[in-house]
């Protein structure tokens, strides 16, 4: 039975030309991480895999750093970069988890951090 | 040497899941060098990637066939295996599973040829 | 996705001739670790394919070598230098840099 709960940054806003880190947090089970993937609709962004490190798509090669820990910076940002962001969490028994943010990158100076919340 | 195998139906009827798998011989899944693929060929035509699966559970699929794909291993088997459901006569193809190579270095890893190929059995979706 | 389109569609040689195939990406397969991962393989009638080439030009254990492959960026060939009549089949390209891994539309090669 899957028992655990992500945890993400939620709805996110952002500065033309910043970055941003992407975080979720998988919690509430005992279960082993064996990767996570970053995706951007259907867009693959990264792969963090407990055993061979990181894999990073290259079209965004030169915009997206590993980490903090499981999570993913996004750097220079557009407009473009506007939309949902999923990380995929591949456990062990349990199965897969899917946590969810949404990225708004605005062009003022007004970008504010979204409230955290939980995905079942 | 390593062998792949396939085995499954070789008739599957509309809106049913297709199930196959790949018994790997000659070595061993729980090998951290190595990427486990499946990939599709239609009639006459070229080849598909469906996705991939490593030996501790993580996997990726092609975009394009996501939302039906499921890729699962079985280390105490040696075997890994592919969920394809809502069948319809455009999944009527050879399928065949591969293993692929893995780079890592610094941190990173990368993915390289297939090597090793099952013989693939014919799917079709008829009722 | 990476697209990748071979020409010539289909190719008839004369044994002993050389042959030559063409693979072009749609986005460079620039590597991030001084290796670009483009592979060449064979697909003989009635069997799976088998690799010929990875990493655009290491020849894979027992490949002979009158088949070499090379190219950057976005353009790759796979030659063969003296067709012989174990050679027909269809031949195709696959990139892996980048998920989903893409095979261009293959090449059959034909002996005259």
């Known amino acids: 039975m899957m028992t655990g709960t992500i945890e993400t940054t939620g709805n996110i806003s952002a500065e033309k030309g910043g970055s941003i880190i992407l975080q979720c947090h998988l919690s509430s089970t005992t279960a082993q991480v064996t990767q996570v993937n970053w995706e951007q609709q259907d867009q693959l962004l990264a792969i963090c895999n407990a055993d061979l490190g990181w894999h990073i798509s290259p079209s965004f090669k030169d915009r997206v750093a590993p980490g903090p820990g499981l999570g993913l910076t996004l750097q220079s940002l557009t407009v473009n970069d506007t939309g949902e962001y999923f990380c995929i969490y591949h456990t062990y028994p349990d199965g897969t988890y899917t946590g969810r943010i949404f990225l708004e990158v605005l062009e003022s100076s007004v970008a504010e951090h979204g409230a955290r919340f939980q995905i079942p | 040497q390593v062998q792949l195998q396939e085995s499954g139906p070789g008739l599957v009827n509309p809106s049913q899941t297709l199930s196959l798998t790949c018994i790997v011989s000659?070595?061993?899944?729980?090998?951290?060098?190595?990427?486990w693929s499946w990939i599709r060929q239609h009639p006459g035509k070229g080849l598909e990637w469906i996705g991939y699966?490593?030996?501790?559970?993580?996997?990726y699929y092609n975009p394009s066939l996501k939302s039906r794909v499921t890729i699962s291993v079985d280390t105490t088997k040696n075997q890994f295996s592919l969920k394809l459901s809502s069948m319809t006569a455009a999944d009527t193809a050879v399928y065949y599973c591969?293993?692929?190579?893995?780079?890592?270095?610094?941190?990173?890893?990368?993915?390289?040829?297939?090597?090793?190929w099952g013989q693939g059995p014919t799917v079709t979706v008829s009722s | 996705e990476i697209v990748l389109t071979q020409t010539p569609l289909s190719l008839s040689v004369t044994p002993g001739q050389p042959a030559s195939i063409s693979c072009k990406s749609s986005?460079?397969?620039?590597?991030?670790?001084?290796?670009?991962?483009l592979s060449w393989y064979l697909q003989k009638p009635g069997l799976p394919p088998q690799v010929l080439i990875y990493?655009?030009?290491n020849r894979f254990s027992g490949v002979p070598d009158r088949f070499s492959g090379s190219g950057s960026g976005t353009d790759f060939t796979l030659k063969i230098s003296r067709v012989e009549a174990e050679d027909v089949g269809v031949y195709y390209c696959?990139?892996?840099?980048?998920?989903?891994?893409?095979f261009g539309g293959g090449t059959k090669v034909e002996i005259k």
């Open positions: 591969a293993r692929g190579s893995i780079a890592a270095r610094s941190g990173y890893f990368y993915f390289s040829g297939l090597d090793v």
């Open positions: 000659g070595g061993s899944i729980r090998s951290g060098d190595y990427y």
């Open positions: 699966i490593y030996y501790s559970g993580g996997t």
């Open positions: 986005q460079s397969l620039l590597p991030s670790d001084g290796k670009t991962y």
């Open positions: 990493e655009v030009s």
């Open positions: 696959m990139q892996s840099i980048q998920l989903p891994l893409t």
